[in-house]
């Protein structure tokens, strides 16, 4: 992937607005949108002034760690969906848009320079991630579309403007 | 102890310029940003805007976006907030606040600001 | 833009317990930050991430946030917590939103 791609704004919109419309989708659905468990999936909130004031690389970490989980998470639901005697139609398809999404996001980080969380020397500092659970297809896709909204978003923002310098 | 202490209180006519100050003592200034706030006679808050000292970033609230300008300077651990054209309906309670994890964790006394023919 | 929608008024009997609510759109999903205000006086920040307490605020203040939802509840009353209450919230984007103000009366 080009090195800068992901400081595209357009780049990160794309994906954003994928994740949305498949919360939207799945918004309307109940007991066919269950996950019939809860999966673990990092916690979405922000801070604002305190993300702010995050080391940058304190920023990759939780960052790094967040796609982790989520992509973890998106999987797992792959696998509920796939052992569901009547899956609600629309959602395998959405599943796949946010399970290539997350492989995409990952390889544009990696080209912006993003080292990945095990490698980064803040990592064994780092606070253990906030998690918190998803037991529908649409929390899921809702935790997809506001990690991307918020703290990838914030980080690639940053990342970006250090990379102009 | 933390203290924002802001400039007194004004009466202006519609048209005029205005500058109001917020100067920070008992912490470092440019480790936090610096919000700013109106109240309407007998209304709620409202976010204005704020700004990070230290990087010169500023956010204002679309509400407010080019009807005021925020500033710093952090030699003298103050922040300002300005109109170059005052109106009737900016009559109102400017507060300042320090903007930390703990959101407006500590406030000015407020500057009274009166706009009348 | 982002909108919180608070009750103009809530009262409360001595000793009782007081819930303030705000709601907007997936609030859970925010943090969301109380403040009391009393005539007068500057706003005071007596919730913040939800439902952390800063110092010199009293235990009988406490916060809770999920769906479209962040309530206040005070519970022992006393009068002295007669005041305006206000909610507010980061967006990812950086603004701060205040609810509209909760007017707290303590009966009696």
């Known amino acids: 992937a080009p090195p800068r791609l992901i400081c595209d704004s357009r780049v990160l919109e794309r994906y954003l607005l994928e994740a949305k419309e498949a919360e939207n989708v799945t918004m309307g659905c109940s007991e066919s949108c269950s996950l019939n468990e809860n999966i673990t999936v990092p916690d979405t909130k922000v801070n604002f002034y305190a993300w702010k004031r995050m080391e940058v690389g304190q920023q990759a970490v939780e960052v790094w760690q967040g796609l982790a989980l989520l992509s973890e998470a998106v999987l797992r639901g792959q696998a509920v969906l796939a052992n569901s005697s009547q899956p609600f139609e629309p959602l395998q398809l959405h599943m796949d848009k946010a399970i290539s999404g997350l492989r995409s996001i990952t390889t544009l980080l990696r080209a912006l320079g993003a080292q990945e969380a095990i490698s980064l020397p803040d990592a064994a500092s780092a606070a253990p991630l906030r998690t918190i659970t998803a037991d529908t297809f649409c929390k899921l896709f809702r935790v997809y579309s506001n990690f991307l909204r918020g703290k990838l978003k914030l980080y690639t923002g940053e990342a970006c403007r250090r990379g102009d310098r | 102890e933390v203290q924002l202490v802001q400039s007194g209180a004004e009466v202006k006519k519609p048209g005029e310029s205005l500058k109001i100050s917020c100067k920070g003592s008992?912490?470092?200034?440019?480790?936090?940003?610096i919000g700013w706030v109106r109240q309407m006679p007998g209304k709620g808050l409202e976010w204005m805007g704020w700004i990070d000292p230290y990087r010169s970033e500023i956010r204002y609230s679309p509400s407010f976006q080019g009807q005021v300008t925020i500033s710093a300077d952090k030699s003298i651990s103050t922040a300002y907030l300005q109109w170059s054209s005052l109106k009737a309906s900016d009559t109102a309670m400017y507060y300042c606040?320090?903007?930390?994890?703990?959101?407006?964790?500590?406030w000015g006394q407020g500057t009274l600001v009166t706009v009348s023919s | 833009s982002y909108v919180l929608t608070q009750p103009p008024s809530v009262s409360v009997a001595p000793g009782k317990t007081a819930r303030i609510t705000c709601s907007g759109d997936?609030?859970?999903?925010?943090?969301a930050y109380w403040y009391q205000q009393k005539p007068g006086q500057a706003p005071v920040l007596v919730i913040y991430d939800d439902s952390k307490r800063p110092s010199g605020i009293p235990e009988r203040f406490s916060g809770s946030n999920s769906g479209n939802t962040a309530t206040l509840t005070i519970s022992r009353v006393e009068a002295g917590d007669e005041a305006d209450y206000y909610c507010a919230t980061w967006t990812f984007e950086g603004d701060y939103v205040f609810g509209g103000g909760t007017k707290l009366t303590v009966l009696g």
């Open positions: 008992g912490y470092s200034f440019t480790s936090y940003w």
């Open positions: 606040a320090r903007v930390s994890s703990e959101p407006f964790d500590s």
């Open positions: 997936k609030l859970g999903d925010h943090y």
